[in-house]
Interface confidence: low
């Protein structure tokens, strides 16, 4: 399926709107600090060139690869060296090394201001130019989330414009907009984290890791589909994600559209739940398929033990085609257990593989592997017990209290990790309670385990940028599926040398009074992490006293007439009382 001009091919397949949107995303994900108008110029240049190639595929330059064309545009940016430093060195390389170089400079934590939605300003911008508004959303999200799944971002941008379409005509714009934007924000952040995990899986553990994850997920969603069908879907889906993670956004979006078409054309053999999705237009269709509920498990499925424990030929089957045999084990297990987390299903498959490796080398393999399902039981029990304990704690403490308990837990485990990262990760971990503990039993494990995988991947990604803890590196790199059990098993670090008490970190000003509640919480939680880094062995009682003193101090000064004076006088007293309480 070769084309004379790749750019013309993609432009024709995707249409101008999607082409422009995807190019804008690509540029924004690479050059995260460039202003919007700069990107628009680059996009327009490339779009005009694509149109030239559509009109005449043999036009000069039209035969170039997309990486070459994209890279040439990026390297034209005048301020490349001042703004991005050694990223400019990428431009001295040839493809494919140049693109690899650009990819390696993507920043997962760019220093960009928080987006604060102001309904009136946003509605004015929306009414002035809907197209520009749409593009600005793509740009702002893409530069903050350099691995965001591009075709899905187009979907969210349309939804976002839809919200403004509806709310900017409302009497109270804020009341209409803000809750909708917040709901969308949560979804967008989760979507970003999911794609970041997919890309990390491919980059750090190879595409086999993503394929295994997808086999489990799709088998749960489509339990009526045959193994061959699931394998085909997994192969196609892996290609889509590989392309998006590699910055090949036009190919990725095009292939994703083809996959959605294939799924809908073959829905009779895939799932009975797809009908509604398949009636939708492209972007909604693909999103809907990705989120579709799990189909009912077919009746009268034989017990798993028949093929994988009782059969005398298990070792023969395994040794003849290891990947296919383990794949079918994962498929059969997953389609029977929609209530298990994907990560748990992958641990089961890993343990099953290890058992076969051990047993098939013995004199009586069958006697060895026939009890394998009993051996696997603990892998299901462990997360179930952990979920029960943590949900009990969440119900007792509430989200904020649970976050603080996790801050204590994780700061003691890995005190070397930066304070902002510990706060961010612990806050996210605490939200698992709100998100998952309220769900019915059958949904708790997938919700918890798979959400934790996303958060721990964020920790791993941030830690990789500036590694400070061997324990974190070990948990992040040894095994993708065992990351969560690895972190759960960490104990307080006894080798850690406490930080000296830094008064600066406990100096506060009147600006804290006007902060939104969330920002206030983050300030308090930052102080809590710093306290623990100073006194890792502080008791719960000591920490409680210090935090209560801190809250009382903030409340008192924020109620004072001269707030700044109050902070100046009471702040040093707080430092003394804190040191005393921790002595």
């Amino acid at each position: 399926d070769t084309h004379k001009s790749e750019i013309a091919h993609r432009f024709k397949d995707l249409g101008e709107e999607h082409f422009k949107g995807l190019v804008l995303i690509a540029f924004s994900q690479y050059l995260q600090q460039c202003p919007f108008d700069e990107h628009v110029k680059l996009v327009n240049e490339l779009t005009e060139f694509a149109k030239t190639c559509v009109a005449d595929e043999s036009h000069a330059g039209c035969e170039k690869s997309l990486h070459t064309l994209f890279g040439d545009e990026l390297c034209k940016v005048a301020s490349l060296r001042e703004t991005y430093g050694d990223m400019a060195d990428c431009c001295e390389k040839q493809e494919p090394e140049r693109n690899e170089c650009f990819l390696s400079h993507k920043d997962d934590s760019p220093d960009l201001p928080k987006l604060k939605p102001d309904p009136n300003t946003l509605c004015d911008e929306f009414k002035a130019d809907e197209k520009k508004f749409w593009g600005k959303y793509l740009y702002e999200i893409a530069r903050r989330h350099p691995y965001f799944y591009a075709p899905e971002l187009l979907y969210y941008a349309n939804k976002y414009n839809g919200v403004f379409q509806e709310c900017c005509q409302a009497e109270d714009k804020g009341a209409c907009l803000l809750p909708k934007i917040e709901t969308m924000r949560e979804k967008v952040l989760a979507s970003s984290a999911r794609q970041r995990l997919r890309c990390a899986s491919i980059q750090k553990f190879g595409e086999r890791a993503l394929k295994a994850w997808s086999v489990a997920r799709l088998s749960q969603k489509f339990p009526k589909a045959e193994f061959v069908e699931v394998t085909k879907l997994v192969t196609d889906l892996t290609k889509v994600h590989k392309e998006c993670c590699h910055g090949d956004l036009l190919e990725c979006a095009d292939d994703r559209a083809d996959l959605a078409k294939y799924i809908c054309d073959n829905q009779d053999t895939i799932s009975s739940k797809l009908k509604e999705c398949c009636d939708k237009p492209l972007l909604e269709k693909s999103h809907c398929i990705a989120e579709v509920e799990k189909d009912a498990i077919p009746e009268n499925l034989p017990p798993l033990t028949a093929d994988f424990a009782e059969d005398k030929d298990v070792c023969k089957n395994y040794q003849e085609a290891k990947d296919a045999f383990l794949g079918s084990f994962l498929y059969e297990y997953s389609r029977r257990h929609p209530e298990y987390a994907v990560s748990v299903l992958l641990r089961l498959a890993k343990e099953y593989e290890a058992t076969l490796e051990e047993c098939c080398a013995k004199d009586d393999p069958h006697a060895c592997y026939s009890t394998v399902f009993d051996k696997l039981k603990h892998l299901v029990d462990e997360p179930q017990n952990l979920i029960k304990q943590n949900c009990d704690q969440f119900e007792k403490l509430g989200e904020y209290g649970f976050q603080n308990a996790l801050i204590v837990r994780y700061t003691r485990k890995v005190p070397q990790v930066s304070t902002p990262t510990l706060v961010e990760v612990s806050r996210s971990l605490g939200k698992v309670g709100t998100r998952c503990c309220t769900k019915p039993e059958s949904e708790r494990m997938p919700c918890t385990e798979d959400y934790l995988s996303l958060i721990l991947n964020r920790l791993c990604v941030l830690h990789e940028k500036t590694p400070v803890s061997e324990k974190v590196t070990k948990c992040c790199t040894e095994s993708l599926v065992n990351r969560r059990p690895c972190f759960s098993a960490l104990t307080p670090d006894e080798t850690y040398v406490p930080k000296a008490f830094d008064e600066k970190l406990f100096t506060f000003h009147a600006d804290i009074c006007t902060l939104p509640d969330t920002e206030k919480q983050i300030k308090k939680q930052t102080a809590l992490v710093e306290l623990l880094k100073h006194k890792p062995k502080a008791t719960e009682e000591q920490l409680k006293t210090v935090m209560e003193n801190f809250v009382a101090f903030v409340d008192k000064c924020c109620a004072a007439d001269d707030k700044e004076a109050c902070f100046a006088v009471e702040g040093p007293k707080l430092v003394v009382s804190t040191q005393t309480a921790l002595a």
């Epitope: 101008e16 709107e17 999607h18 809907e130 939804k159 379409q165 909604e284």
Partner: nanobody, 126 residues
Framework: EVQLLESGGGLVQPGGSLRLSCAAS????????VAWFRQAPGKEREFVAG????????YYADSVKGRFTISRDNSKNTLYLQMNSLRPEDTAVYYC???????????????????WGQGTLVTVSS
Amino acid sequence: EVQLLESGGGLVQPGGSLRLSCAASGRYIDETAVAWFRQAPGKEREFVAGIGGGVDITYYADSVKGRFTISRDNSKNTLYLQMNSLRPEDTAVYYCAARPGKPLITSKVADLYPYWGQGTLVTVSS
């Protein structure tokens, strides 16, 4: 230049259904944002439902949400409005409107649509 021709209107009892069609010529229908508007006697023209150009995200007025469905068949270059559970207050002349240039989303503002059909009358009465 886009020409639009509506059909499918008529008299229907409350609770009944009708399907309106709007055939477009002069431009591909998937390259335009298209919408249905209606105008009851003595009232302003109001937005009913719309579908974006190229991206196909749909929008509905609150009064018809869950009862009406907008769709298009690109191969036939035709826009549809499936109207179920019709009520007397749905009585109006229904117009099809187009806004070329592949706008990403539809607009509820009638003035933004340069191309209009001549309308088809829908009467809901027992």
